[in-house]
């Protein structure tokens, strides 16, 4: 089931997925002056079985000069309404991470791909937020948003990330030393976190991120 909306926008923050659930689609977008090859895939699709997941199809871009145009290839109107953009990719290298059943890693860049990746996320997808350069989070721990299905409608949970002040750059997991175990709102030290997604391993990995207090939901 595709998520209807984009992940929430947080002031002075960007989001990134550590891995992508099966069913996720990534548009094959080319940078200006290039286009998809003839009969090329419109998108890559995360598929697989319980033991292994990978991206089906390959995105390929070719110069559009032969067509005497520099117009960028964009999705058709019916595709457009489902566009999900990750602001982080430009493009990203795969993140070194544990293999998650039913999830694909970040696809490697393809030649002449667009600077912005457009994903079509599915229910259960989790994305992580960090403050942009020059801003710093008020709280520590992963700020995450999950696409959930409620009463037949999809919605993203709201990360309580507050990015403030002209501070040093914050990093994504794996790019700075670990800080603290992931926390949500101040929860009793003897009680369990209320994060119940199959992404718990990713929550552990994202513990290096500086984020905020509501990383686990009230329930």
């Amino acid at each position: 089931e595709l998520c209807d909306d984009d992940p929430p926008e947080i002031p002075h923050a960007t989001f990134k997925a550590m891995a992508y659930k099966e069913g996720t689609m990534l548009n094959c977008e080319c940078k200006r002056g290039f286009r998809r090859i003839k009969s090329g895939s419109l998108y890559m699709l995360c598929t697989g079985n319980s033991s292994h997941s990978s991206w089906d199809n390959q995105c390929q871009c070719t110069s559009s000069a032969t067509r005497n145009t520099t117009k960028q290839v964009t999705p058709q109107p019916e595709e457009q309404k489902e566009r999900k953009t990750t602001e982080m990719q430009s493009p990203m290298q795969p993140v070194d991470q544990a293999s998650l059943p039913g999830h694909c890693r970040e696809p490697p860049p393809w030649e002449n791909e667009a600077t912005e990746r457009i994903y079509h996320f599915v229910v259960g997808q989790m994305v992580y937020y960090q403050c942009v350069q020059g801003y710093r989070a008020l709280h520590r721990g992963p700020a995450e948003s999950v696409c959930k299905m409620t009463h037949g409608k999809t919605r993203w949970t709201q990360p309580q990330l507050i990015c403030t002040g002209e501070m040093e750059t914050s990093q994504f997991p794996g790019e700075e030393k670990p800080q603290a175990s992931p926390e949500g709102r101040p929860e009793s030290e003897t009680s369990c976190l209320v994060t119940t997604t199959d992404f718990q391993i990713q929550t552990e990995m994202a513990a290096t991120m500086e984020t905020s207090i509501f990383t686990t939901e009230y329930q």
Partner: antibody, heavy 114, light 111 residues
Framework: EVQLLESGGGLVQPGGSLRLSCAAS????????MHWVRQAPGKGLEWVSV????????YYADSVKGRFTISRDNSKNTLYLQMNSLRAEDTAVYYC???????WGQGTLVTVSS | QSVLTQPPSASGTPGQRVTISCTGS?????????VHWYQQLPGTAPKLLIY???ERPSGVPDRFSGSKSGTSASLAISGLRSEDEADYYC???????????FGGGTKLTVL
Amino acid sequence: EVQLLESGGGLVQPGGSLRLSCAASGFTFSSYGMHWVRQAPGKGLEWVSVISYDGSYKYYADSVKGRFTISRDNSKNTLYLQMNSLRAEDTAVYYCAAGVPDYWGQGTLVTVSS
Amino acid sequence: QSVLTQPPSASGTPGQRVTISCTGSSSNIGAGYDVHWYQQLPGTAPKLLIYSNNERPSGVPDRFSGSKSGTSASLAISGLRSEDEADYYCAAWDISLNGPVFGGGTKLTVL
């Protein structure tokens, strides 16, 4: 259970100083930004100051800038507010709060009067 | 003067639905920051009632709901009860102050 317990309030003369403390328990104190919020008698809530989880940055309301200092000791799970050059208009119940803020202490009364 | 604007008072009879508004600016609510609502019963500390515009902490009845649009937000209380008589405050982060700002508070009276 999350608990925030303020102390250090009392009666002080204008121009005097006080140091408020807030003892936190029931959560990982060192992971959260902390606030001081005050409420003058019969009035609304007024944010005073915030400190990041590691104490690396602090912000203050204009009304207290240069007179109040927020600090924290993560090894003691304690938040502080050093209040100098106190004025009559600083009279209020002072609450310490965690996060959004979503958890609040019960408050400590500061009275500035001659 | 508070940065967020709320009506000073609101009232309703038991069972009724009441709405409290909260208006901000482009540096707080309009900048994309979430709105949170607090309930303060007489003589007690504020308690978080709604977070992230429309989410309820555990223990808060579903009679309480929140919404946000543009530079304003609102709190709705349906099926009003006598124990809802309290002061209600909205709050949001303000990027120009680097701290949360509060509304002036709305005193709710259950007639």
